[in-house]
């Protein structure tokens, strides 16, 4: 805390300038005016101000909004966003996605701070769902974000969202995860045609059904064994041979090199040897 | 660097239990999502449960109801309950930690080098 004193003759801050990294701190607090530094936020980052220095102008932006800043001076709060506490962004209610990406560029090159991880979960609370706008720049400050959401927080993510989901983002999503933005893929890329829509719902095909492996297995999608290996082996299991072999188009001999592994091996225990030799792979029941 | 090790594997009768642990360094503020693996022999690893930034949890079909997963954020280590345990449990059992927003050293996820549990029938 900043003992309170009178501002020096000639001292009194007209406007948010260099000269006033030459104040010292009890200076700062007693010569400029709490509304004036929030009117004037965006020349604070300007200014080389020292850590110290910025503590007494968060002090007094503290002692101006007790509730908590409005959006205006948060979008403009630059490096002073360093120095706010968990607890300050508790108070804020920021919903322009501006802000947010304000904020977030600030931080980068850092951790994600217990600030950022508060700050990204207001937001996120405020508007009630995770749109697409969000996504894409949460997802391009922190690649692997929609992985770190739980199935629960994903159920929020509106299909319109998806579009925003490139395939790197789904890399570190388990099975539960993909069981939750499957339906929301189909529904986003329903009106795509047959070749177009299986490139945009490949990376998703981890959650799918056995009845859309059914209906993609008569699109000659050519599916690779990287993306078969992924499905849902209970999905797997109902299929038959004939299905598996239209659905995998050339890479069919693939299934060969692993049929050891899950979910070909208990694919495999369940089709007729019979069925299995029309492939030719020697595949053994 | 960030460094996984798991510990509490062993060999078990059928029926048994055991509890597997995995301890985590070398991070610090991000989130953190915490995920057991297994291996069976000659097979892939296979997804077996989660643990989210949010704390909720999600298990693959076959370990539902006998498996539980749990974490004390303050040491850093998650947990694998795993009870009622079958000769099909056998296998390799990893730890992975997918992180997000932390300035660490080497890619996301990082793997531990597992434990062995054996479930004799």
């Known amino acids: 805390e900043v003992e309170k004193t009178a501002c020096p003759s000639g001292k009194k801050a007209r406007e948010i300038d260099e000269s006033l990294i030459f104040y010292k701190k009890w200076e700062l607090e007693a010569c400029v005016d709490a509304a004036l530094l929030a009117t004037q936020m965006d020349r604070v980052n300007a200014i080389p101000f020292t850590y110290e220095q910025l503590d007494v102008l968060k002090h007094k932006l503290d002692e101006l909004y007790p509730q908590g800043y409005p959006e205006s001076v948060i979008q403009h709060l630059g490096y002073l966003f360093l120095k706010m506490s968990p607890e300050d962004i508790r108070k804020w209610n920021v919903t322009s996605l501006e802000t947010l990406k304000a904020l977030l560029e600030v931080n980068k090159g850092h951790e994600m701070s217990p600030q950022v991880a508060t700050l990204i979960d207001r937001f996120v609370k405020g508007r009630g769902q995770l749109d697409k706008d969000t996504l894409d720049t949460l997802t391009a400050f922190y690649p692997g974000y929609l992985c770190s959401l739980s199935p629960e927080e994903l159920s929020s993510v509106p299909p319109s969202s998806i579009w925003a989901v490139r395939p790197q983002d789904l890399d570190t999503c388990d099975p539960r995860q993909l069981d939750v933005l499957y339906p929301k893929a189909r529904l986003a890329f329903q009106n795509m045609n047959g070749s177009e829509y299986f490139v945009k719902i490949q990376s998703f095909l981890g959650g799918a059904p056995t009845e859309d492996l059914k209906a993609l297995s008569q699109q000659n999608v050519s599916m690779d064994l990287a993306t078969f290996m992924k499905l849902r082996t209970d999905a797997v299991l109902p299929l038959t041979v004939a299905e598996v072999q239209k659905l995998l188009g050339p890479h069919v001999e693939g299934l060969k090199a692993e049929e050891r592994h899950r979910p070909v091996r208990d694919w495999i225990l369940r089709q007729r040897q019979d069925d299995l030799d029309t492939l030719g792979l020697g595949l053994q029941g | 660097q960030v460094h996984l090790v798991e510990s509490g594997g062993g060999s078990v009768q059928a029926g048994g239990s055991l509890r597997l642990s995995c301890v985590a360094s070398g991070y610090r503020n991000c989130r953190s999502t915490m995920r057991w693996y297994r291996q069976g022999p000659g097979q892939v690893r296979d997804w077996v449960s989660s643990?989210?930034?949010?704390?909720?949890?999600s298990y693959t079909d076959s370990v539902k109801g006998r498996f539980t997963i749990a974490q004390d954020k303050g040491k850093n280590t998650v947990y694998l309950q795993m009870n009622s345990l079958q000769p099909e449990d056998t296998a390799m059992y990893y730890c992975r930690i997918d992180l997000v927003g932390c300035n660490v050293a080497g890619g996301s996820p990082y793997w531990g080098h597992g434990t062995q549990v054996t479930v004799s029938s």
């Open positions: 643990i989210y930034t949010d704390g909720t949890t």
